[in-house]
C-alpha cells in the first residue's frame, strides 16, 4: 500500500489532522521536498544579517551580512566584522599589522613582506601595513661591481607585535 503522504509535493505537508490530505505550508514556513509531514519554519535574517533571498513555500530564506561584515559558517550562520586594510581580525578585535607584515584585504591575517634578497633581488618599493614590498632587479644588474643588498625584514609571526 502506497503511503498517501508521498503524493504531497514540496510546498505542502501531509496533514494528519485532516485525513492525510496535502495542505499548503502556513505563512513563514516551507517544505523543500515532497512527502513531508511538517513544514519547517523560515529562517529570519535579523540584526547584522540581511535577507539575500526571501523564503518561499518550497525554499528557506537565505541571509548574508550587512556592510562591514562578512559571512562565516555553513549557510552564513555567522557574520564576522571586516577590518581595514593594514589590519587583521584577532580574538580581541581589529589590530594593525606589525612591522614587516601586511594585509591588502578587509579580512584574513597579516602576512610577512616578501624577502626580495631570497631571489637575489633588491627592494624597489618599501612595504607598508597595506602593501607588500615590490622587488626590483638584482643589485648587480643596477650597478655593476656594487652589491648593496637590502637586508631582509625580520621574520616574525604574522600580526603579533611583541609586547
Amino acid at each position: 500500500l502506497q503511503d498517501p503522504c508521498s503524493n504531497c509535493p514540496a510546498g505542502t505537508f501531509c496533514d494528519n489532522n485532516r485525513n492525510q490530505i496535502c495542505s499548503p505550508c502556513p505563512p513563514n514556513s516551507f517544505s523543500s521536498a515532497g512527502g513531508q509531514r511538517t513544514c519547517d519554519i523560515c529562517r529570519q535574517c535579523k540584526g547584522v544579517f540581511r535577507t539575500r533571498k526571501e523564503c518561499s513555500s518550497t525554499s528557506n530564506a537565505e541571509c548574508d551580512c550587512t556592510p562591514g561584515f562578512h559571512c562565516l559558517g555553513a549557510g552564513c550562520s555567522m557574520c564576522e566584522q571586516d577590518c581595514k586594510q593594514g589590519q587583521e581580525l584577532t580574538k580581541k578585535g581589529c589590530k594593525d599589522c606589525c612591522f614587516g607584515t601586511f594585509n591588502d584585504q578587509k579580512r584574513g591575517i597579516c602576512r610577512p613582506w616578501t624577502n626580495c634578497s631570497l631571489d637575489g633581488k633588491s627592494v624597489l618599493v618599501n612595504g607598508t601595513k597595506e602593501r607588500d614590498v615590490v622587488c626590483g632587479p638584482s643589485p648587480a644588474d643596477l650597478s655593476p661591481g656594487a652589491s648593496s643588498v637590502t637586508p631582509p625584514a625580520p621574520a616574525r609571526e604574522p600580526g603579533h607585535s611583541p609586547q
Epitope: 581580525l89 584577532t90 580574538k91 580581541k92 591575517i109 600580526g159 603579533h160
Partner: nanobody
Framework: EVQLLESGGGLVQPGGSLRLSCAAS????????MSWVRQAPEKGLEWVSS????????FYADSVKGRFTISRDNSKNTLYLQMNSLRAEDTAVYFC?????????????????WGQGTTVTVSS
C-alpha cells in the same frame, strides 16, 4: 566529515547558570584546540574562550573572565562552556569552533570549522 553540534542553550534569568556542550566528530578531537564564539542579535562575532587540545591551556575574553569556564573531555569528544552569573549582555547564539592547531592563544583567530549554534537568552 567534520561536524560540531552544540546543545544546552535556553532561557535563563540574570544571575543564573547554563552549561553548553559541543559534540565533535569526524576528526581527532584531542589534536585540536577548540573555541567558543558568540553572536549577539545586533553585533558581529565575538570570541568568548579557547582551550588547547590537551585542555592544559585556557583563554578567556575579558567580558566573561571569572564567570565562564571552558573545559573538554577528550574521551567523549566533547567541549563544554560553564556559564555562571549570566547577564543580559550574554544573550547570543553560541558557536563552538575547531581551531587549526593543537595549541591556541588569546590573539589569533585560527578557526576553520563551526557548529550551527545554540541560543542563550538571559532575561527576567
Amino acid at each position: 566529515e567534520v561536524q560540531l553540534l552544540e546543545s544546552g542553550g535556553g532561557l535563563v534569568q540574570p544571575g543564573g547558570s547554563l552549561r553548553l556542550s559541543c559534540a565533535a566528530s569526524g576528526f581527532t578531537f584531542s589534536s585540536y584546540a577548540m573555541s567558543w564564539v558568540r553572536q549577539a542579535p545586533e553585533k558581529g562575532l565575538e570570541w568568548v574562550s579557547s582551550i588547547s587540545g590537551s585542555g592544559g591551556s585556557t583563554f578567556y575574553a575579558d567580558s566573561v573572565k571569572g564567570r565562564f569556564t571552558i573545559s573538554r573531555d577528550n574521551s567523549k569528544n566533547t567541549l563544554y562552556l560553564q556559564m555562571n552569573s549570566l547577564r543580559a549582555e550574554d544573550t547570543a547564539v553560541y558557536f563552538c569552533a575547531k581551531e587549526g592547531a593543537t595549541e591556541t592563544d588569546d590573539y589569533h583567530f585560527n578557526t576553520d570549522v563551526w557548529g550551527q549554534g545554540t541560543t542563550v537568552t538571559v532575561s527576567s
